[in-house]
């Protein structure tokens, strides 16, 4: 498994490496092979990151922030590889690294610019606040500041509230949208331009269903092909909103193909699941089953929310008994 980092070549012996927070990266450096190899990696021309000479590491004066986080490709040094393997990068590691390589033939200096990005998987939440309904796109930790765009029925929305809190290393961002009384579909996109990573949340409201007590209801939930990739790990959760909060009825994990059902009247069709159809049945309806049902299909790259409103009405029998 290669660490997530990619190199952008720029002139004058300078390269840009983009890494992801807490992951490992490689700072590249090569030289014309020769004997008597000396390698010194420095940060911002001041701090000692890693030193190698006379055939071994010399880390006595290594800056403490790099302790146990750096190593070279020792078997490849004689082939001209002076690259630095760098563990668990943080945003404080961003900056310019200089690799000095001396041999019996020559001395070369390479510069590597390290940029670090953060993109913890965002979420799209549906919330009721009093009589208002909100969609909230949020990302707990992101760096640099992302681009957030909303669309309603595939048309961009200009109004875009962003609640932002900054910590030492990253931003936490909420973008709420009031969708009270709307039957439109909504889409929120969060883009990290540095990591070239985009996440999309999509919300769809289905037509309301009217059912009689004791009947069963079938609620559809199928991913949109544009986003859905069956090879990618995802999770499907069905939940029901009661007094402003959702309780989970069932969930399915694609990685283990496990289904967990918390409501005995809930059923999933295994064959449909294999065809990426996560529609569900709820048997033996009662009046308290009225409400909003939410299907959430989520992966690292998307969240698809489908809302069904179910109205359960008393059956004629029940009504005549009363």
């Amino acid at each position: 498994i290669f660490p997530l980092a990619f190199f952008i070549y720029v002139p004058m012996n300078e390269q840009i490496v983009i890494g992801r927070l807490d992951e490992d990266i490689i700072l590249p450096s090569s030289f014309e092979r020769g004997s008597e190899v000396v390698i010194h990696w420095k940060y911002q021309d001041s701090y000692k990151v890693h030193s190698y000479y006379k055939g071994s590491d010399h880390l006595e004066s290594q800056d403490p922030r790099y302790a146990n986080r750096t190593s070279l490709f020792y078997n490849e040094i004689q082939n001209g590889n002076a690259s630095l393997f760098f563990r668990r990068v943080s945003l404080l590691d961003e900056g310019i690294y200089t690799c000095y390589v001396g041999t019996a033939i020559q001395v070369i200096t390479n510069k590597v610019v390290l940029k670090v990005g953060v993109f913890l998987t965002p979420v799209m939440k549906y919330e009721k606040r009093n009589t208002n309904s909100f969609l909230i796109c949020s990302v707990l930790s992101v760096y640099p500041r992302p681009i957030i765009t909303w669309k309603m029925d595939n048309t961009p929305i200009s109004e875009n509230n962003m609640e932002e809190t900054g910590s030492l290393d990253s931003f936490s961002i909420n973008s709420p949208l009031n969708i009270t009384g709307s039957n439109s579909s909504y889409e929120c996109t969060i883009e990290n331009s540095l990591l070239k990573q985009t996440w999309t949340g999509r919300w769809t409201m289905k037509d309301g269903l009217h059912k009689m007590q004791s009947e069963h209801v079938s609620l559809s939930c199928q991913p949109v092909n544009d986003y859905f990739s069956p090879n990618q790990d995802f999770k499907v959760t069905w939940s029901r909103m009661k007094s402003g909060t959702f309780s989970v009825l069932a969930y399915y994990l694609s990685s283990s193909q496990n289904t967990i059902i918390n409501e005995s009247r809930f059923s999933w069709n295994k064959e449909l699941i294999n065809q990426s159809d996560f529609s569900m049945n709820l048997m033996d309806l009662n009046l308290s089953d009225s409400g909003e049902y939410l299907c959430n299909i989520s992966s690292d790259e998307y969240t698809l929310l489908t809302i069904h409103t179910v109205h359960v009405e008393p059956s004629q029998e029940t009504a005549s008994h009363n």
Partner: antibody, heavy 121, light 107 residues
Framework: QVQLVESGGGVVQPGRSLRLSCAAS????????IHWVRQAPGKGLEWVAV????????YYADSVRGRFTISRDNSKNTLSLQMNSLRVEDTAVYYC??????????????WGQGTLVTVSS | DIQMTQSPSTLSASVGDRVTITCRAS??????LAWYQQKPGKAPKLLIY???SLESGVPSRFSGSGSGTEFTLTISSLQPDDLATYYC?????????FGQGTKLEIK
Amino acid sequence: QVQLVESGGGVVQPGRSLRLSCAASGFTFSDYGIHWVRQAPGKGLEWVAVIWYDASDKYYADSVRGRFTISRDNSKNTLSLQMNSLRVEDTAVYYCARDRSSGAMGYFVYWGQGTLVTVSS
Amino acid sequence: DIQMTQSPSTLSASVGDRVTITCRASQSISSWLAWYQQKPGKAPKLLIYKASSLESGVPSRFSGSGSGTEFTLTISSLQPDDLATYYCQQYNAYSYTFGQGTKLEIK
């Protein structure tokens, strides 16, 4: 071609100070570590001090530690050795010598012609 | 400090002779050893580094061998120009130390 030229030697009394200089040319000075090595008249060679290419590391022989200070100015391609509290036994020809690379290797590829320091009352 | 002991202190040989100078370290220095030649009134000149690597521009009649604590400098066929004092130097650890020198005279 690589050239190292020492200067600043002379006769000085014990306890006094002297500053030696080494002017470098013919190579990228800021890429290389430089050492001072001395040789008492009719005696063998003795390593004195080293300064790394970027001046990040400086090391001294026990016999001079605390009295001598090595420094460099990469913008002027010059090396200096500030010698304080001089003793009679510091009398020697002082050579500046270029390391193989950063200063970390510790052997001397190019040498200057030397400058004589005589400590005598 | 690591002590370096050279033998012999003086050596007299004829042109064309094979000459060997020995250097012993007081503790192991792996192969971190250099040999220098110093002619009268001149600065030393690097001959060999890393015990056996010949410095660029040095005649191939010079060779070095050894590792650990025992090292030798060999001149395969002595030339008049080789009249000099030869020094070994360890660069395994600070402080770097030299042998006391071997003065080579031509018979």
